[in-house]
């Protein structure tokens, strides 16, 4: 049976040319991190972090993605384009695929609220 | 290329203790977890636990909690599974398997216990 | 605890035959994985998430399956495919099928 929890940075908002921190993080179970993968919205790959190969950014991405803090993805330079879901994918052994989900709405407005709280979604 | 080398057959008595060892090559051992399955002659395979090989942490199936120990030698890429106080039932060969979808286990270790 | 049935237990197959081996489970898994074993040989992954070919695998062995049915089917059955197969799934407690031994006539 699978243990763990996925908790998130689950709703957040960042001001548009900002940053902002993907956060996702995995709890209450003994398995072994093999890999994780980010992912956006319409189901491209923005990131991996692989245990043994280390962190991967896609080309289309590498501009404007940094790796971290810890497993986490910063999404730097945000625009408009950049507002909708995010998905972080744990494959361990022996649980298999733990998912967690993010909403990112990137707010043209100065006084975008930065929410950093962590949720289970 | 990625290997896992188990050491040779083992010929014990009951009571006995033996350690059988699984020495990976070819990718970053603490990258995986290790799992040990037994097999009995004639019968499937049965799943026996695994170990952290990050943190070190074995966690055991119920049906080898007791007697089973799984341990590591990091520096030399090596995992262990010791079985202490033998009994016939014992007799089977052992596999180390890499904890992921890549396929990849030892060659086997066969262990005997006999009076 | 998963456990995991296969079906039949014993098949016998001719030369060129299509052939599908099954593995229910009692409750519902997210993957399986196939493995081949021959006598005195370690397991050899065939098919590993259900229906992903394992490198040097023969086109020939495909998998598919949801839920709590899962199947491993052989194309053409040669003479080298004559071997046990077994299904394994993780899911916290990984299990083994009781396993499928494959007859060539």
């Known amino acids: 049976m699978m243990t763990g929890t996925i908790e998130t940075t689950g709703n957040i908002s960042a001001k548009k040319g900002g940053s902002v921190i993907l956060q996702c993080h995995l709890s209450s179970t003994m398995a072994q991190v093999t890999q994780v993968n980010w992912e956006q919205h319409d189901h491209s790959l923005l990131a991996i972090r692989n245990a043994e190969l280390g962190w991967h950014i896609y080309p289309a991405f590498k501009d404007r993605v940094a790796p971290g803090p810890g497993l986490g993805l910063t999404l730097q330079s945000l625009t408009m384009n950049d507002t909708g879901e995010y998905f972080c994918t744990y494959h361990t052994y022996p649980d298999g695929t733990y998912r967690g989900r993010i909403f990112l709405e990137v707010l043209e407005s100065s006084v975008a609220e930065h929410s950093a709280r962590f949720q289970i979604p | 290329q990625i290997q896992l080398v188990q050491s040779g057959p083992e010929l014990k008595k009951p009571g006995e203790t033996v350690k059988i060892s699984c020495k990976a090559s070819?990718?970053?051992?603490?990258?995986?977890?290790m799992s040990w399955v037994k097999q009995t002659p004639g019968k499937g395979l049965k799943w026996m636990g695994w170990i952290n090989t990050y943190s070190g942490v074995p966690t055991y199936a119920d049906d080898f909690k007791g007697r089973f120990a799984f341990s590591l030698e990091t520096s030399a890429s090596t995992a262990y599974l010791q079985i202490n106080n033998l009994k016939n039932e014992d007799t089977a060969t052992y596999f180390c398997?890499?904890?992921?979808?890549?396929?990849?286990w030892g060659q086997g270790a066969t262990l005997t216990v006999s009076s | 605890q998963i456990v995991l049935t296969q079906s039949p237990a014993i098949m016998s197959a001719s030369l060129g035959e299509e052939i599908t081996l099954t593995c229910s489970a009692r409750?519902?898994?997210?993957?399986m994985h196939w493995y081949q074993q021959k006598s005195g040989t370690s397991p050899k992954l065939l098919i590993y998430?259900?229906?992903n070919l394992a490198s040097g695998v023969p086109s020939r062995f495909s998998g598919s399956g949801s839920g709590t049915f899962f199947s491993l089917t052989i194309s053409s059955v040669e003479a080298e495919d004559a071997a046990d197969y077994y299904c394994?799934?993780?899911?916290?407690?990984?299990?083994f099928g009781g396993g499928t031994k494959l007859e060539i006539k």
């Open positions: 998430s259900t229906s």
């Open positions: 070819g990718y970053t051992f603490t990258a995986y977890g």
């Open positions: 409750s519902s898994v997210s993957d």
């Open positions: 394994h799934q993780w899911g916290g407690y990984p299990t």
């Open positions: 398997t890499r904890g992921d979808t890549g396929g990849y």
